[in-house]
């Protein structure tokens, strides 16, 4: 009879055991355990009858289809074999051990007691077959086994090849290299591989193998393992295989497909190819003259590109364009984008015209181009280049007037100062009355007049004031404060200011510049009460022209001292301190009791002690501060009187030979003009210089020159 | 014509506030000043202070900065003094007046429980 | 404050006469600057606004008849009405404007 097993382990004992077997006696087990498991069997008992190749009795051990052992007896002979100690394995998971005794038995004889187990199969070892081993990586578990494949494969639906992804791989430079995955190690099997060249229409693809060709192949069949086909629009070359590469390919078309196929077995180290991208032809190209192509080759395809550039001084002219550089290129149909341009001679073109200055050619024809050279000078001498630049500027390579200081700023001409048209009179002669002065011998001399038309009636004054550039007026804070009611500080309104420049004689305006003011700036510490800080200053609405009635005046250097005691100096105005006098009758021009033409004095300045002392001994509250200076004389006369409010007290600068403004008309004592002791007093500009240029917006070293040379 | 139109009389409890207009036509209102004037029967003229519209500039007389308030509306040329704190002290006559040469018609002012 | 004082406060003439009256400043009200003299001159008729008559102490204002006259400087001035007509009852008031404004007590004048 047949007994069927399925436990995992299990005791086997002859019928009867450990009493003798019966004779005549056949039992079958049968023992199956789970796939990935074999049978171990081992004997602790064996004690069968003895027989030639047990003949008689015997415990047999088998598979399916192969017998494993036949035992009998109870010692080991030529003959016959007991298990004794050895241990019978199945190969798989089944074991049939069969028991059979004869039909007598000469002794008495125990039969056999055996154990089984199911024992773990190491796959992963004892696999030797490449058709079921592992392709990368193998891991033993109890009652099976696995594959997993390196980084960068996939595992086969096979689950034991490792195959890679490589349907996705689109080639579009001119250029390039396409292997077999992990080339030069075998590459994987059981792979599909799609390599796509897509190269621009008006290419051809040139595919050439190189190095290793190791494609798995058949001696017989072509090619029914592994194979590269390539294919070219409807037409497929191949398929290749074996070691010998194919010869290099001109597939005449923008677009190539690769396909590799690779299957589930085989060790070969596969291919490598390089694709080359190869066009139409273009014509030779010749480079214009004064100019060269870049890159310089024997020959151009399409798509190559050529930069034509031109000689420096001379710009790349394309369809009356001109350029840096112009860009060309070689199209499929082996013709260029564009024919070679010319180069032209760079022109700078007409100078920019340069305000109060002139512009010299040294070239001769008044030429512009490229290298080409012009001066710029200033009107002299109302107008000087500042910081003595040369003036002369080169056509440059970019197109543009250069000079080596300015670069391609234009210089500038700055109003010269202190250099009157007439040279004032000798200071070697006292002046003690006023006279006349000729035209041009105060060209900063400046008639403000101011209407206040927010009154009823309109309430107009005037007073002086001093050039000092082309935009700006110096003046007194007391001219140009609005009139309130209170003790305020509040600047007139612009629109309510005219100043009028180069007036001579006040009933002929026609020769004079008259000028709205853009911004009235009073100084911000001006006290109303005892006219310190008594100056403020003027924007003209438009920059006026110099010339020899109107130049501007210098300014003092920074000097808290002031003008030196008893040093000479000229004030001028038309006399309209007059207080009988009407600014009506002024402006019309239509009275006698002023004068119309321009007067001028001749006053020495005052100790400080002294002009202080003279104040303070009136009564009233006068008070001659530190940045107020007097002039005058002790014996009075009418001259101190001259000159309106806020105009300028010059003295010749010896060191710059020029004529600076270092006081402006403020105020003076109660008593009538020219009396005894009654000096006039000055607001002292040294002490305001800093304020002055900041307010202009100047930098100091701008204009310091023009005093200090 | 130049003209100063003023608002008509108010009659007014002590510490209340009263606003008097003076609307000006025939002339560019924005650039002369509006001066306003106090006047009371036995005490003769006193001068409050002045704006000028266009800039919104004021002067007070000291006496009357915690008293009046002066404001102008330039889109329909008006000017205002605001009179605040009332007491019968400021029962009066109010002129407002184009910068000395033109009066307003005045507003006359009663303070009275 | 400027102070202003009108002499005499009220004065009777009979029409046709001439008639002067006074007023003093406490300050100078010449102006340095603009060179002018902040006294002006209203004529207050009986139920009337004032009326300017004289600015910068001697200008005539446009429309005023020229029997008004004002003069003086520094800080005396008079206003003059070289002969007095009925329509001139009023009371006359003078205002310096060289700083905060302020006006003098006034002048009556009654027609006999």
């Known amino acids: 009879h047949t007994v069927e097993l399925n436990n995992m382990f299990g005791q086997i004992q002859s019928p009867g055991y450990p009493d003798s077997y019966p004779s005549d006696s056949e039992v079958t087990w049968n023992i199956t355990v789970p796939d990935g498991f074999r049978i171990k069997l081992y004997f602790m008992h064996f004690n069968l009858e003895s027989s030639y190749l047990c003949e008689y009795d015997y415990v047999k051990v088998e598979t399916e289809d192969q017998v494993l052992a036949t035992f009998c007896g109870r010692e080991t002979t030529d003959t016959e074999q007991t298990p004794g100690q050895e241990v019978v394995l199945s190969p798989g998971s089944f074991m049939s051990i069969t028991f059979r005794s004869d039909f007598s038995n000469e002794e008495r004889f125990t039969g056999f007691d055996a154990h089984y187990m199911a024992v773990d199969v190491d796959e992963c070892k004892e696999r030797e077959d490449e058709e079921l081993s592992c392709d990368h990586y193998c891991h033993n578990y109890i009652g099976g086994y696995y594959c997993s494949c390196r980084f960068g494969y996939i595992l086969h639906t096979d689950n034991r090849t490792c195959r890679v992804e490589c349907s996705d791989n689109l080639f579009t430079q001119r250029t390039g290299v396409i292997t077999s995955p992990d080339f030069p190690n075998p590459y994987p099997k059981s792979s599909e591989c799609l390599y796509t060249i897509e190269l621009e229409e008006g290419f051809m693809v040139n595919l050439q193998f190189e190095d290793i060709f190791d494609i798995e192949d058949h001696p017989e069949v072509p090619c029914p393992y592994d194979y590269i086909k390539i294919k070219v629009g409807p037409k497929v070359l191949g398929p290749f295989c074996g070691e010998k590469a194919p010869e290099p390919i001109s597939t005449q078309s923008h677009s190539v497909l690769i396909l590799f196929h690779s299957d589930n077995s085989g060790e070969n180290r596969g291919w490598r190819l390089s694709y080359r991208a190869a066009g139409n032809e273009c014509p030779e190209l010749q480079p214009p003259v004064h100019g060269k192509i870049e890159p310089s080759q024997a020959k151009y395809f399409f798509k190559d590109q050529v930069l034509v550039s031109c000689d420096t001084g001379y710009k790349v002219l394309k369809d009356n364009v001109e350029m840096d550089t112009f860009q060309i290129e070689c199209l499929k149909d082996g013709t260029w984008s564009n024919k070679i341009p010319t180069c032209k001679i760079v022109d700078c073109r007409a100078p920019g015209e340069l305000e109060h200055g002139l512009i010299t050619f040294s070239t001769r024809n008044n030429l512009t181009t490229y290298k080409s050279e012009i001066k710029y000078s200033c009107q002299e001498p109302y107008y000087k280049m500042l910081n003595n630049n040369t003036g002369i500027y080169t056509c440059s390579a970019q197109g543009v007037w250069m000079n080596k200081v300015l670069g391609r700023s234009l210089p500038t001409c700055l109003p010269e100062c202190g250099q009157p048209s007439r040279s004032l009179p000798s200071l070697v002669k006292r002046i003690i009355g006023g006279r006349n002065a000729e035209p041009g011998l105060f060209p900063w001399q400046a008639l403000i007049v101011v209407e206040d038309t927010s009154r009823v009636p309109n309430d107009k004054w005037f007073g002086s004031g001093a050039l000092l550039s082309a935009s700006w007026i110096l003046t007194a804070a007391h001219v140009l404060r609005s009139q309130r009611r209170d003790t305020t500080v509040i600047p007139v309104s612009k629109e309510h200011v005219t100043v009028y420049l180069g007036l001579h004689d006040v009933r002929d305006k026609s020769g004079a510049v008259n000028s709205s003011a853009a911004r009235v700036v009073l100084h911000p510490d001006f006290n109303i009460q005892n006219y310190n800080h008594d100056i403020a200053l003027v924007q003209l609405q438009e920059p006026v022209p110099l010339g020899p009635h109107v130049m501007p005046v210098c300014l003092p250097r920074l000097e808290p001292e002031g003008p030196a005691p008893h040093m000479l100096g000229l004030v001028a105005g038309w006399g309209i301190s007059n207080p009988n006098v009407t600014v009506d009758e002024i402006i019309s021009s239509g009275t006698r009791t002023l004068s119309d033409v321009l007067q001028y004095v001749k006053l020495p300045v005052v100790p400080h002690a002294e002009c202080k002392t003279s104040y303070e001994s009136r009564s009233g509250n006068y008070s001659v501060t530190e940045n107020m200076f007097c002039a005058g004389y002790y014996e009075g006369g009418k001259d101190t009187c001259l000159g309106d409010s806020g105009g300028a007290f010059v003295i010749f600068d010896d060191l710059s030979q020029r004529w600076v403004v270092q006081g402006l008309v403020s105020w003076g004592g109660p008593e009538e003009c020219g009396s005894k002791q009654v000096y006039g007093v000055y607001t002292k500009v040294s002490n305001y210089v800093d304020w002055v240029w900041e307010q202009m917006g100047l930098p100091q070293s701008v204009v310091e020159p023009q005093v200090e040379r | 014509e130049v003209q100063l139109q003023q608002s008509g009389a108010e009659l007014v409890k002590p510490g209340a506030s009263v606003k008097i207009s003076c609307k000006a036509s025939?002339?560019?209102?924005?650039?002369?000043?509006i001066e306003w004037v106090k006047q009371r029967p036995g005490h003769g003229l006193e001068w409050i202070g002045e704006i000028l519209p266009g800039s919104g500039s004021t002067d007070y007389n000291e006496r009357f900065k915690d008293k009046a308030t002066f404001t102008a509306d330039t889109s329909s040329n008006t000017a205002y003094m605001q009179l605040t704190s009332l007491t019968p002290d400021d029962s009066a006559t109010y002129y407002c007046?184009?910068?000395?040469?033109?009066w307003g018609s005045g507003t006359t002012l009663t303070v009275s429980s | 404050d400027v102070v202003m004082t009108q002499t005499p406060s009220s004065l009777a003439v009979s029409a046709g006469e001439k008639v002067t009256m006074s007023c003093k400043s406490s300050?100078?009200?010449?102006?340095?600057?603009?060179?002018?003299?902040?006294l002006a001159w209203y004529q207050q008729k009986p139920g009337q606004s004032p009326k300017l008559l004289i600015y910068?102490?001697?200008t005539r204002e446009s429309g005023v008849p020229d029997r008004f006259t004002g003069s003086g400087s520094g800080t005396d001035f008079t206003l003059t009405i070289s002969s007095v007509q009925a329509e001139d009852l009023a009371i006359y008031y003078c205002k310096q404007s060289y700083t905060l404004p302020t006006f003098g007590g006034g002048t009556k004048l009654e027609i006999k």
């Open positions: 025939g002339y560019t209102f924005t650039g002369k000043w």
């Open positions: 910068w102490a001697s």
């Open positions: 007046v184009r910068s000395e040469d033109l």
């Open positions: 300050q100078s009200l010449l102006n340095s600057v603009t060179r002018k003299t902040y």
